[in-house]
Interface confidence: low
Amino acid sequence: RGVFRRDAHKSEVAHRFKDLGEENFKALVLIAFAQYLQQCPFEDHVKLVNEVTEFAKTCVADESAENCDKSLHTLFGDKLCTVATLRETYGEMADCCAKQEPERNECFLQHKDDNPNLPRLVRPEVDVMCTAFHDNEETFLKKYLYEIARRHPYFYAPELLFFAKRYKAAFTECCQAADKAACLLPKLDELRDEGKASSAKQRLKCASLQKFGERAFKAWAVARLSQRFPKAEFAEVSKLVTDLTKVHTECCHGDLLECADDRADLAKYICENQDSISSKLKECCEKPLLEKSHCIAEVENDEMPADLPSLAADFVESKDVCKNYAEAKDVFLGMFLYEYARRHPDYSVVLLLRLAKTYETTLEKCCAAADPHECYAKVFDEFKPLVEEPQNLIKQNCELFEQLGEYKFQNALLVRYTKKVPQVSTPTLVEVSRNLGKVGSKCCKHPEAKRMPCAEDYLSVVLNQLCVLHEKTPVSDRVTKCCTESLVNRRPCFSALEVDETYVPKEFNAETFTFHADICTLSEKERQIKKQTALVELVKHKPKATKEQLKAVMDDFAAFVEKCCKADDKETCFAEEGKKLVAASQAALGL
């Protein structure tokens, strides 16, 4: 039942154009180009996309026409390499154009920048946006795709089409509402937050495939799909995993047309076979394509079948364990992971993968021993501490979150992580710690049975952000070690890091702690970021500062900002009171 075995097509570009339709074809080519050439102006990309689209239409009309038999990588790569300013804008990325496929595409992929030097997206006034939307809806929506894709070069392309559809719906509805802003702004905020989360989740999938290989991604998919579809047979889950792996490999590899096409096929297959997959799919399968695929990806876990037998019989007590393992190691381990995961929707995927790794290690050792059964008989005893560690950590941190609230919980994490890895840049520490802190409001509200999958799998996504940002400019051996040694042990590795005793404190620079009246006009979120940036810098100057010392300084700082923002002459207040604050802080911290 291989969904993706297709007849060979004379023209790949014509085949994808016909499968996807013109609108999706153009949108996906725009996303692909913007994710590769992140600095190019919008107009240049639109021109390239139009040229590719016109060419695709000639191939639809006649698949034997000149160049229609070329691969998509060749066609798109040739098009990207026509950009006149490639060397000036992208430097050594221009050298990719001297290579042949498939090396050229690999070269473009390696130059994708997770933190491109682009201005922050500033949201215009609602009336300005509505006018732009009405004046030229098509350009307005293309601009959205372009701006998101260039800032998130691994965004899951078919999902970005779904976001664009919701973006369009928001403007269509709200630009004719009585109170446009009240209607539109909450919708845009929701799309922004969901978009960031979607981007980060996909970035982890791509990192998993690119840094740890297909086997690692498939193991993740077996565990997650087994939790989600516990009634499905192992063969069914394996088939879904194979197809899902192909979809994500394509999207992470820049093959966005194939990825979107194959994702649609997978959604179709799931809906046609929902009886043997899950009872929760009915509503999803009644939706249009983009909504359907999104809905399936987010669908709740099905109920566990009643009376599942004990795992011990097949995986510990059976005399055939080593025989079964030797015959087909990955299949046997896949069955173990499937059986364990479908019984444990209360575990995080990374925990399930740790258990499977422990089981694999034990079998590797024991199946070579004199008495294998005696050796692996107590392997399940090994699991208890692995399970308890995240349970305890989540319990402690949720208690701390409930005690402090989100902002102060983020601050506690900022201090904790700055002390662990003080070499990491301040903006990265602030961004990552703020996101780590969001685990509280996201997961601590859940009952015990849902806390661990929510929290630990979310933390894996956030720590991957740290890993990809750090990989661009590596500054800490400890971060590199935690990021590269084991995908599933990243979180325990970071949790285990103590204060970095080798760190030489940063020289004190009063400029870092000089603030101006512009802070008063910032939003609450931006003001928090300013204060948290100062907190990180304080810890970098004085890594041995106690919680009490840091709290005292931060309280003084908050009072100083509040006082000066109420003053008549704000700038003078910031200048004079700021000097006093810096002196008092230096004294308090013994700087």
Partner: nanobody, 126 residues
Framework: EVQLLESGGGLVQPGGSLRLSCAAS????????VAWFRQAPGKEREFVAG????????YYADSVKGRFTISRDNSKNTLYLQMNSLRPEDTAVYYC???????????????????WGQGTLVTVSS
């Protein structure tokens, strides 16, 4: 290769205390999962307490929880077992075991520990 050498055993009255030490050489003790096991005459070797490699998460057998404390001093490359409120049933030879490769969690399965000390005898009797 890891060498382990236990010390601190002896005769003690019920309710008394002892502190066992295990000096490691050949590898840093914080890079290994380390544990204490014990074997009473005519009985199987059993897990007493363990501590993960690279992370100070500790585990105890139910029979010793609240009475025994495992710890390590990385600067001295030494593992300790503080035993309070000793009972006659704690009488056994106590072994220190190490499992390198920095496992984050210690194992309670003796077979998974490749390195063992010679053992030190603890006798609890009046």
């Amino acid at each position: 290769e890891v060498q382990l050498l236990e010390s601190g055993g002896g005769l003690v009255q019920p309710g008394g205390s002892l502190r066992l030490s295990c000096a490691a050489s050949g590898r840093y003790i914080d890079e290994t999962a380390v544990a204490w096991f014990r074997q009473a005459p005519g009985k199987e070797r059993e897990f007493v307490a363990g501590i993960g490699g690279g992370v100070d998460i500790t585990y105890y057998a139910d029979s010793v929880k609240g009475r025994f404390t495992i710890s390590r001093d990385n600067s001295k490359n030494t593992l300790y077992l503080q035993m309070n409120s000793l009972r006659p049933e704690d009488t056994a030879v106590y072994y220190c075991a190490a499992r390198p490769g920095k496992p984050l969690i210690t194992s309670k399965v003796a077979d998974l520990y490749p390195y063992w000390g010679q053992g030190t005898l603890v006798t609890v009797s009046s």
